[in-house]
Interface confidence: medium
């Protein structure tokens, strides 16, 4: 590694990043007929153009606009599932409940899910050694700005009843500093969104508390109510049952006893 290369606190670009993005794009457009028109090479060029040769602490939402334009996608605005700190269950749920969508079920979310990337100022190289950490280095890094941009657009598109899955095992069930708390909540459009419904996912098998009464949930309710959006909350006491019982409620384990 050349000695002059900037060392950041976060992990470097995911190995085989260009190939991964291109392969994911091809796979997604094959599976989703409504996105068949997308030219994946152009998508990669737009993605690359957002961060290559730019200082990785000086990325803006404007840098991602060409990519946003190419990845424009219409999902049913009343079938949006947001999540915070519980991505795996949210994704399992939309696999079972095929007509609901997380951000990662859209093309742009699917392309970037679990990947890291950054470049270097004034060189066309991708930095595979390290990338800026949001806390330790800077918030305007390529990954953070990407997720802020797509999350804002996703929330802005939502309508009617919007659902959010929250992790009831965490000390802050609702965290104002999460992407959901800092971006999505503030970009739901009150003229389109009637209700935000939180699904609080319990961790412990014997946990029968009403986590909808948690102070952080009350804080979320307050924020949402001030934005003239109704708030609803439900406990999901057994996430394993939840997935299986939404589709097959007559299963013997789907009675209400915890």
């Amino acid at each position: 590694v050349p000695r002059w290369r900037q060392q950041w606190s976060g992990p470097g670009t995911t190995k085989r990043f260009p190939e991964t993005v291109l392969a994911r794009c091809v796979k997604y457009t094959e599976i989703h007929p409504e996105m068949r028109h997308v030219d994946c090479q152009s998508v990669w060029d737009a993605f690359k153009g957002a961060f290559i040769s730019k200082h990785p602490c000086n990325i803006t939402e404007e840098d991602y606009q060409p990519l946003m334009k190419l990845g424009t996608q219409t999902v049913p605005c009343n079938k949006i599932l947001l999540w915070s700190r519980i991505k795996d269950l949210a994704h399992q749920f939309t696999q079972v409940q095929r007509d609901m969508f997380t951000l990662e079920d859209t093309l742009l979310g699917y392309l970037a899910d679990d990947l890291t990337w950054c470049g270097e100022f004034n060189t066309s190289k991708i930095n595979y050694q390290s990338c800026p950490d949001w806390r330790k280095d800077c918030s305007n890094n390529p990954v953070s700005v990407f997720w802020k941009t797509v999350s804002r657009r996703f929330a802005e598109a939502a309508c009617d009843v919007v659902h959010v899955m929250l992790n009831g095992s965490r000390s802050k069930i609702f965290d104002k500093n999460s992407t959901f708390g800092s971006v999505e909540v503030h970009n739901l459009q009150p003229e389109k969104v009637q209700t935000l419904e939180a699904w609080v996912i319990h961790g412990g098998r014997e946990d029968s508390r009403d986590l909808c009464q948690d102070p952080t949930i009350k804080e979320l309710e307050s924020i949402i109510s001030k934005r003239n959006i109704q708030f609803s909350c439900k406990n999901i006491y057994r996430p394993d049952k939840f997935l299986q019982c939404v589709k097959n409620p007559e299963d013997s384990s789907c009675t209400s006893e915890i």
């Epitope: 419904e197 406990n235 999901i236 006491y237 789907c254 209400s256």
Partner: antibody
């Protein structure tokens, strides 16, 4: 005011189908179920099935499986119950009701009821 | 399916008296039991859910108790508007099932 308003009475011939609608207004709770319950003249109540409109998830009582179809149009807040291959024993008042409970996917009781739709099956 | 049996079929009570209605499940339904009131030509109305919780707007003279297989609906002092048919419903096991009803009539 929270209410469910159902379509009007129907007279049908044996073997035909009937489709009853149930329009919701003022429902504040997002993920609720709309259940369908029928009551034959002078008889008790019988649960037929339900839909969770927000999830488009349906579930039917085994007795009616294959004959009943429950759908929902979220844009108009309307649920529908279609019963096919009608016979005289299907003459009943059909109610829609909102199901609420502590669990999203499973248990609920019916807290708000439509006014009922009388379906008469007669040749 | 769970069979819900209500007794008595008919209960004759004078206004101001206490009425006690019984509902028995063929197997345990925990506390997942509701009571409804139905007057002629009207839709049922929720009175009690969770075996003992009064629904919104239901007068305090209505109370529910029990869990498992034995449940009771008590109307402490019958008013003229309380004469109706009462149904219990279990929502613990599919399919949801109702009792056959108890008719409370004026003595």
């Amino acid at each position: 005011q929270v209410q469910l308003v159902q379509s009007g009475a129907e007279v049908k011939k044996p073997g035909s189908s009937v489709k009853v609608s149930c329009k919701a207004s003022g429902l504040p709770d997002a993920t609720y179920a709309i259940g369908w319950v029928r009551q034959a003249p002078g008889q008790g109540l019988e649960w037929m099935g339900r839909i969770i409109p927000a999830l488009a998830a349906t579930h039917y009582a085994q007795k009616f499986q294959g004959r009943v179809t429950i759908t929902a149009d979220e844009s108009t807040s309307t649920a529908y119950m279609e019963l096919s291959s009608l016979r005289s024993e299907d003459t009943a008042v059909y109610y829609c009701a909102r199901g609420l409970g502590y669990y999203l996917y499973s248990s609920y009781y019916f807290d708000i009821w439509g006014q009922g739709t009388l379906v008469t099956v007669s040749s | 399916e769970i069979v819900m049996t209500q007794s008595p079929a008919t209960l004759s009570v004078s206004p101001g008296e206490r009425a006690t209605l019984s509902c028995r499940a063929s197997q345990s339904v925990s506390s997942n039991l509701a009571w409804y009131q139905q007057k002629p030509g009207q839709a049922p109305r929720l009175l009690i859910y969770g075996a003992s919780t009064r629904a919104t707007g239901i007068p305090a003279r209505f109370s529910g108790s029990g869990s498992g297989t034995e449940f009771t609906l008590t109307i402490s002092s019958l008013q003229s508007e309380d004469f109706a048919v009462y149904y219990c419903q279990q929502y613990n096991n599919w399919p949801w099932t109702f009792g056959q009803g108890t008719k409370v009539e004026i003595k």
